[in-house]
């Protein structure tokens, strides 16, 4: 088992509005979940983006989640990730 | 470390409101973190209310219709609870108690306060 | 609203014993669980969250599992200290929810 390295990033989306995306990279096996909390509850999935968990080459593999935020709110949301039993959390970066 | 202490009445009559404050030492309330109420009726069912976020934000158990209000004041660093219009079934021990936002589970708790609905 | 139905309500066990309580789920909470102690008189203390994870100072001898809508608590070699009564509490969504309970008692 390979635990995943998870980075979580920010980028301007439409005014008043900020993109957020969770990357989980270099693990292995391949599955994993990876989705979005707010306020410490599960984000409806309709309102997050998922990208294939795809190969990085290394043997391993990578992929990510993404929801838009109003920005000021990032303090409402975090990534989750679970990987082979195990599992953290991850802030926003302000 | 963060401390929770609940107070207010023990004893509200029917048809009032009850008002019920958390004070918070330790950490402030408009940092981070969610505010909580929960309260646990005789027999032990334990039902969550709702809470206010560290902005201000509210999140409230529908069940509970609009009779409920969670307030703060920033500059005492306590936050409130009012239930209006009681009824006996309201009879039960209140707790508050915070959550973070990794999840909304509640590793900190006040002491109860037992609140009597009656005539 | 997601329901949580414990099981079952009360237990006797004696010390050094293993015991197990059951959570279930009305709708899939995804590892969204937590467990609670609560002695009489007191508030009720976590245990377990995200369905697996010991909170901070928590005994080894207990231990979370399950997935979809089904949980449960084992304590191992239960101990004078474990008595009392104990709760599941998913947060996958909104209304939080708690359990009803199971009480454990010395045999």
């Known amino acids: 088992t390979v635990p995943p390295m998870v980075n979580v990033t920010r980028s301007e989306a439409s005014e008043g509005n900020i993109t957020v995306t969770c990357r989980a990279s270099s693990f292995y096996p391949r599955n994993i979940i990876l989705t979005w909390r707010q306020d410490g509850v599960s984000l409806s999935n309709d309102t997050q983006q998922w990208g294939d968990v795809l190969p990085d080459g290394n043997g391993t593999y990578q992929t990510w989640v993404a929801t838009r935020i109003c920005r000021g709110e990032e303090q409402r949301f975090t990534c989750y990730m679970e990987h082979s039993g195990n599992h953290s959390t991850h802030p926003v970066p302000s | 470390d963060v401390q929770l202490q609940g107070s207010g009445p023990g004893l509200v009559k029917p048809s009032q409101s009850l008002s019920l404050t958390c004070s918070v030492t330790?950490?402030?309330?408009?940092?981070?973190y969610y505010w909580n109420w929960i309260r646990q009726f005789p027999g032990n069912k334990l039902e969550w209310m709702?809470?206010?976020?560290?902005?201000?934000?509210?999140n409230y158990n529908p069940s509970l219709k609009n009779r409920i209000s969670i307030t703060r004041d920033t500059s005492k660093n306590q936050f409130f609870l009012k239930l209006s219009s009681v009824t006996t079934e309201d009879t039960a021990t209140y707790y508050c108690?915070?959550?973070d936002g990794r999840g909304a589970w509640f590793a900190y708790w006040a002491q109860g306060t037992l609140v009597t609905v009656s005539a | 609203d997601i329901q949580m139905t414990q099981s079952p309500a009360s237990l006797s066990a004696s010390v050094g014993e293993t015991v197990t309580i059951t959570c279930r789920a009305s709708?899939?909470?995804?590892?969204?669980l937590a467990w609670y102690q609560q002695k009489q008189g007191k508030s009720p203390q976590l245990l377990v969250y995200?369905?697996?994870t010991l909170a901070d100072g928590v005994p080894s001898r207990f231990s979370g599992s399950g997935s979809g809508t089904q949980y449960s608590l084992k304590i191992n070699s239960l101990q004078p200290e474990d008595f009392g009564n104990y709760y599941c509490?998913?947060?996958?969504?909104?209304?939080?929810?708690f359990g009803a309970g199971t009480k454990v008692e010395i045999k």
């Open positions: 709702g809470f206010i976020s560290f902005g201000g934000s509210n």
């Open positions: 108690a915070r959550y």
């Open positions: 330790g950490y402030s309330i408009t940092n981070d």
């Open positions: 995200d369905a697996i």
């Open positions: 509490q998913h947060f996958w969504s909104f209304p939080l929810t």
């Open positions: 709708g899939n909470i995804h590892n969204y």
